[in-house]
Interface confidence: medium
């Protein structure tokens, strides 16, 4: 009875894992809108997928309440510093909830990447990664914003991405 019970338990755990919501969204040419809105993401092609979560205009939409590990990485780079660049770049994950009219900060990082340009080479690279566990209710949304988004380098789906999975 013991071995059979543990086998059933393993199968049950595997089944529960299979339905655990998860998503990994990747950067695409259309990610940077110039509109001041959140970054947009590829949801199907290449490494991107949605399972048990939905997507709408840059937002991952939670369909099942629970604790989620949410994450985002953005690749930053440029030649020299862009005109009008603020002193710091903000990369953040923000929550939208029907219970509150404004986006709520969940995870935010700030950096001053342009300083990496040198007199001998104006080319610079930097990146920002955010990740953490948060509780999300059904219907709540998570978005990624980068100010100044003009610094985000996309190239392929491996450099800048956004995802979540239930823990």
């Amino acid at each position: 009875d013991g071995p059979a019970g543990s086998w059933e338990q393993l199968i049950q755990e595997r089944r529960s894992h299979e339905v655990n919501p998860a998503a990994h969204l990747t950067g695409a040419n259309s990610s940077l809108t110039g509109s001041g809105g959140p970054l947009l993401w590829e949801t199907q092609l290449g490494l991107a997928f949605l399972r048990g979560l939905s997507y709408h205009d840059g937002a991952l939409v939670v369909t099942k309440a629970g604790y989620y590990y949410i994450y985002s990485k953005v690749q930053l780079g440029g030649v020299g510093c862009p005109l009008g660049l603020a002193s710091t770049i903000t990369h953040g994950l923000y929550k939208r909830t029907p219970r509150y009219p404004e986006e709520l900060e969940l995870l935010v990082s700030q950096q001053s990447p342009c300083g990496r340009a040198t007199s001998s080479s104006r080319v610079w690279w930097d990146s920002s990664f955010l990740g953490g566990v948060v509780h999300l209710e059904a219907g709540e949304e998570v978005v990624v914003r980068v100010l100044d988004e003009r610094l985000v380098r996309l190239r392929d789906g491996t450099r800048s991405y956004f995802g979540a999975f239930m823990v």
Partner: antibody, heavy 121, light 111 residues
Framework: QVQLVQSGAEVKKPGASVKVSCKAS????????VHWVRQAPGQGLEWIGA????????SYNQKFKGRATLTADKSTSTVYMELSSLRSEDTAVYYC??????????????WGQGTLVTVSS | EIVMTQSPATLSVSPGERATLSCKAS??????????MNWYQQKPGQPPRLLIY???NLESGIPARFSGSGSGTEFTLTISSLQSEDFAVYYC?????????FGQGTKLEIK
């Protein structure tokens, strides 16, 4: 549609200053750099500098630094280019042009009609 | 600064034929897989008009007979079948770093 409308032709004496305006419409004024480019009669194009109307940040061609001043007025969506200590070789058509949104690729997708500045004693 | 050199200075081509214009930069204008080279057309009494950006991207509203190619320091603008309205002066421009510089222009004239 995007439009850049410049002020009219000017005739100035050597040593004087000129201020050319460029009124933008049809897009979010504070999101795009506005560049200034000049073209002497029968000659090629020369970049003077650019201003980011969002915060007034400027970048200048070293050749014009100290003589050219670029400013932006958000309330009227107008950019100005002032050139001081004019000399005869500054006689040219001066263009304003909208820069692309992505800063690393500063191509100029919309241009003003040009303002002829003549410097003559 | 980056010096842009266009050739030839004048190109005489018959309508319907292909035109190939060249532009060389004094140093590479490539970054992260993109080439920061742009092409403009200018007709007398008019401002320049953007044709091609980042070496090979056709600006909206520009006919498909215009195409751009190249990378590093060498770039080409090709007009596949010349129309009467294509006879003008063409400028290349680098946007890799400021000061943003233009070539001296290639005048495309009717043969």
């Amino acid at each position: 549609q995007v439009q850049l409308v410049q002020s009219g032709a000017e005739v100035k004496k050597p040593g004087a200053s000129v201020k050319v305006s460029c009124k933008a419409s049809g897009y979010t004024f504070t999101s795009y750099n506005v560049h200034w480019v000049r073209q002497a009669p029968g000659q090629g194009l020369e970049w003077i500098g650019a201003v980011y109307p969002g915060n007034g940040d400027t970048s200048y061609n070293q050749k014009f630094k100290g003589r050219a001043t670029l400013t932006a007025d958000k309330s009227t969506s107008t950019v100005y280019m002032e050139l001081s200590s004019l000399r005869s070789e500054d006689t040219a058509v001066y263009y304003c042009a909208r820069g692309s949104y992505y800063y690393t690729s500063s191509y100029f997708d919309h241009w003003g009609q040009g303002t002829l500045v003549t410097v003559s004693s | 600064e980056i010096v842009m050199t266009q050739s030839p200075a004048t190109l005489s081509v018959s309508p319907g034929e292909r035109a190939t214009l060249s532009c060389k930069a004094s140093q590479s204008v490539d970054f992260d897989g993109d080439s920061y080279m742009n092409w403009y057309q200018q007709k007398p009494g008019q401002p320049p008009r953007l044709l091609i950006y980042t070496a090979s991207n056709l600006e909206s509203g520009i006919p498909a007979r215009f195409s751009g190619s190249g990378s590093g320091t060498e770039f080409t603008l090709t007009i596949s079948s010349l129309q009467s309205e294509d006879f003008a002066v063409y400028y290349c421009q680098q946007s890799y770093e400021d000061p943003f510089t233009f070539g001296q222009g290639t005048k495309l004239e009717i043969k």
